[in-house]
Interface confidence: low
């Protein structure tokens, strides 16, 4: 058993049929010594008396808010949550496996630049009685500070018969050094509580590996005289690290016909312009990637050819 | 060429070669497309590689103030990785074909380090750790990790030289 926060405790249980469970001793936070009784949740049934209560925690029915009273007055509470371990593996019932980029990916994170700011998100099908708490650091043995905000519900989607809820959180490294080569990864820890079930999820990454620039901005076409060619130009996204002479991007320019089956013409360039042939009903798209480190490409920015 | 306290390096040449190094580091890794590194586990690892850290002066402001600190650090890293790529980890079984990206990477690391340091002048270099993998699979894992860390190192070096070529070239 360990303390998650004040008056909230997590009991770690091996979860299998007829498991013995864990013996837990609760102590009433009071100077009083006698006349103390204990109840669980809203029930008025007295579970025991005395300053301490010993219980065998085996299942969710044994978890909940234990309250000690004296003469009708509440003295203190202890909320017991359960953390299940099945076949040696901690349960992951609350969050959905996103399966990208690999199986057992519950948390996904992205950064728009090297400033030390990043966003993580996760999915669940649970709509109520759900709380999240997020902590982060750089490195684990001698951790350096990363400050995370509160997790918020950022999207709702319907998937077949189910509703899916996306939560996200923004974090910022306290003393970020954008130009340095990271040697210790960022660690992100999410505590999830659904009713009386506790689970924790972790992710470890370097900012450089989760970089995904915003799409290029101000995408424009300029027809060239007496030619089917056009000059496409664009700018670095506002959110990208500066100076651009140091934090450089490379770009992919694509000409795509109306039909998905039509052959795509692609050009790669380090410049912020390119000359391409504009076909009728086609569109021109540009995306960006860090020039020197192969992290994710941005989403496409597009304009129609006409 | 970068002599401590002396003249500037050939920024444009360094920029071109460091960008080539980035391309090579990514084409060389993974050496086989069939290795799936999930979690690092407790296998032998490469913690001792030199990293370009915050105080090394490789940020735009530090380069403007005095690029020598950063160039010395980059040089040290290039020599370190050049030695690693020439060690038993990369020369042992399973052996690499002579035209593999690793062979080109090795040559380019040497080329860039020589651009930064003329003959006869010696900056202090870091000892390479004694990583002696016992069998081919461990060698593959070490190659994988070394190349992954080299990708991060050469990305910073390439940014330094790109910025230098754009803003510090005479």
């Amino acid at each position: 058993i360990w303390e998650l926060k004040k008056d909230v405790y997590v009991v770690e249980l091996d979860w299998y049929p007829d498991a013995p469970g864990e013996m837990v001793v609760l102590t009433c936070d009071t100077p009083e010594e006698d006349g103390i009784t204990w109840t669980l949740d809203q029930s008025s049934e007295v579970l025991g008396s005395g300053k301490t209560l010993t219980i065998q925690v085996k299942e969710f029915g044994d978890a909940g808010q234990y309250t000690c009273h004296k003469g009708g007055e509440v003295l203190s509470h202890s909320l017991l949550l359960l953390h299940k371990k099945e076949d040696g593996i901690w349960s992951t019932d609350i969050l959905k496996d996103q399966k990208e980029p690999k199986n057992k990916t519950f948390l996904r994170c992205e950064a728009k630049n090297y400033s030390g700011r990043f966003t993580c998100w996760w999915l669940t099908t649970i709509s109520t009685d759900l709380t999240f708490s997020v902590k982060s650091s750089r490195g684990s043995s001698d951790p350096q500070g990363v400050t995370c905000g509160a997790a918020t519900l950022s999207a709702e989607r319907v998937r077949g018969d189910n509703k899916e809820y996306e939560y996200s959180v923004e974090c910022q490294e306290d003393s970020a050094c954008p130009a340095a080569e990271e040697s210790l990864p960022i660690e992100v820890m999410v505590d999830a509580v659904h009713k009386l079930k506790y689970e924790n999820y972790t992710s470890s990454f370097f900012i450089r590996d989760i970089i995904k620039p915003d799409p290029p901005k101000n995408l424009q076409l300029k027809p060239l005289k007496n030619s089917r060619q056009v000059e496409v130009s664009w700018e670095y996204p506002d959110t990208w690290s500066t100076p651009h002479s140091y934090f450089s991007l490379t770009f992919c320019v694509q000409v795509q016909g109306k039909s998905k089956r039509e052959k795509k013409d692609r050009v790669f360039t380090d410049k912020t312009s390119a000359t391409v042939i504009c076909r009728k009903n086609a569109s021109i798209s540009v995306r960006a990637q860090d020039r020197y480190y192969s992290s994710s490409w941005s989403e496409w920015a597009s304009v129609p050819c006409s | 060429r970068a002599v401590p306290g002396g003249s500037s390096p050939a920024w444009t040449q360094c920029q071109q070669l460091s960008q080539k190094l980035c391309t090579l580091a990514w084409s060389a890794h993974p050496l086989v497309g069939h290795m799936d590194l999930r979690e690092e586990g407790d296998e032998e690892t490469t913690n001792d590689v030199p990293h370009i850290q915050c105080g090394d002066g490789c940020d735009p402001q530090g380069l403007r103030d005095n690029s020598q600190f950063c160039l010395q650090r980059i040089h040290q890293g290039l020599i370190f990785y050049e030695k690693l790529l020439g060690s038993d980890i990369f020369t042992g079984e399973p052996s690499l074909l002579p035209d593999s990206p690793v062979a080109q990477l090795h040559a380019s690391l040497l080329g860039l380090s020589q651009l930064l340091q003329p003959e006869g002048h010696h900056w202090e270099t870091q000892q390479i750790p004694s990583l002696s993998p016992s069998q081919p699979w461990q060698r593959l894992l070490l190659r994988f990790k070394i190349l992954r860390s080299l990708q991060a190192f050469v990305a910073v070096a390439a940014r330094v030289f790109a910025h230098g070529a754009a803003t510090l070239s005479p």
């Epitope: - | 069939h34 290795m35 999930r38 586990g41 079984e93 690499l96 069998q135 699979w137």
Partner: antibody
Framework: QVQLVQSGAEVKKPGESLKISCKGS????????IGWVRQMPGKGLEWMGI????????WYSPSFQGQVTISADKSISTAYLQWSSLKASDTAMYYC??????????WGQGTLVTVSS | DIVLTQPPSVSGAPGQRVTISCTGS?????????VHWYQQLPGTAPKLLIY???KRPSGVPDRFSGSKSGTSASLAITGLQSEDEADYYC?????????FGGGTKLTVL
């Protein structure tokens, strides 16, 4: 003594999933990689892939990449080979073998997998 | 597709010497990769016979020896005995996997 003990023979239908195991004993499991080798009826040996003792690195033969999954659980000194959807052509004897300084110096007894409708 | 070529069968009388060849290419044996040999007795799992071109694991009689030259390797068995009747496989590397030869059936006449 040093041995690798494999799970028993399996008879399956096409499309079914299967996971076979290979348990090491009598040596330090965490020093050795475990490889899997297929032998189709009356045919030669084919290397499928190998896994590090912690299960953190798998390396597949190009011919088997995406066809099978190799995993390991160091805590119980066991390596696994699994299929999500078997085909009749997966009918074969499957051997596990350990690799350290010497290549595949100890082999399991083999698991015969028969896939037939 | 087999990238190491072995003769499908060889035979010899008891007491004789036989050799089994294993021919590769510049992308496996010729690249400096080691060659290993395995023996598979009927109905049993393979057993390591020779590793690192010519090294014998403990317990393997010195009647078995291996050698390698250029892009090929060979296994020699002297003083042939009836219990040597088995399939023999050579093995090496390519840049992307371990490869086995097609196997050679040794018959003791």
């Amino acid at each position: 003594q040093v041995q690798l003990v494999q799970s028993g023979a399996e008879v399956k239908k096409p499309g079914e999933s299967l996971k076979i195991s290979c348990k090491g004993s009598g040596y330090s499991f965490s020093n050795y990689w475990i490889g899997w080798v297929r032998q189709m009826p009356g045919k030669g040996l084919e290397w499928m892939g190998i896994i590090s003792p912690t299960g953190s690195v798998t390396w597949y033969s190009p011919s088997f990449q995406g066809q099978v999954t190799i995993s390991a659980d160091k805590s119980i000194s066991t390596a696994y080979l699994q299929w999500s959807s078997l085909k009749a052509s997966d009918t074969a004897m499957y051997y596990c073998a350990r690799w350290y300084y010497k290549p595949f110096d100890v082999w399991g007894q083999g698991t015969l997998v028969t896939v037939s409708s | 597709d087999i990238v190491l070529t072995q003769p499908p069968s060889v035979s010899g009388a008891p007491g004789q010497r036989v050799t089994i060849s294993c021919t590769g290419s510049s992308s496996n044996i010729g690249s400096g990769y080691d060659v290993h040999w395995y023996q598979q007795l009927p109905g049993t799992a393979p057993k390591l016979l020779i590793y690192g071109n010519s090294k014998r694991p403990s317990g393997v009689p010195d009647r078995f020896s291996g050698s390698k030259s250029g892009t090929s390797a060979s296994l020699a068995i002297t003083g042939l005995q009836s219990e040597d009747e088995a399939d023999y496989y050579c093995s090496s590397w390519t840049p992307s996997s371990v490869v086995f030869g097609g196997g050679t059936k040794l018959t003791v006449l």
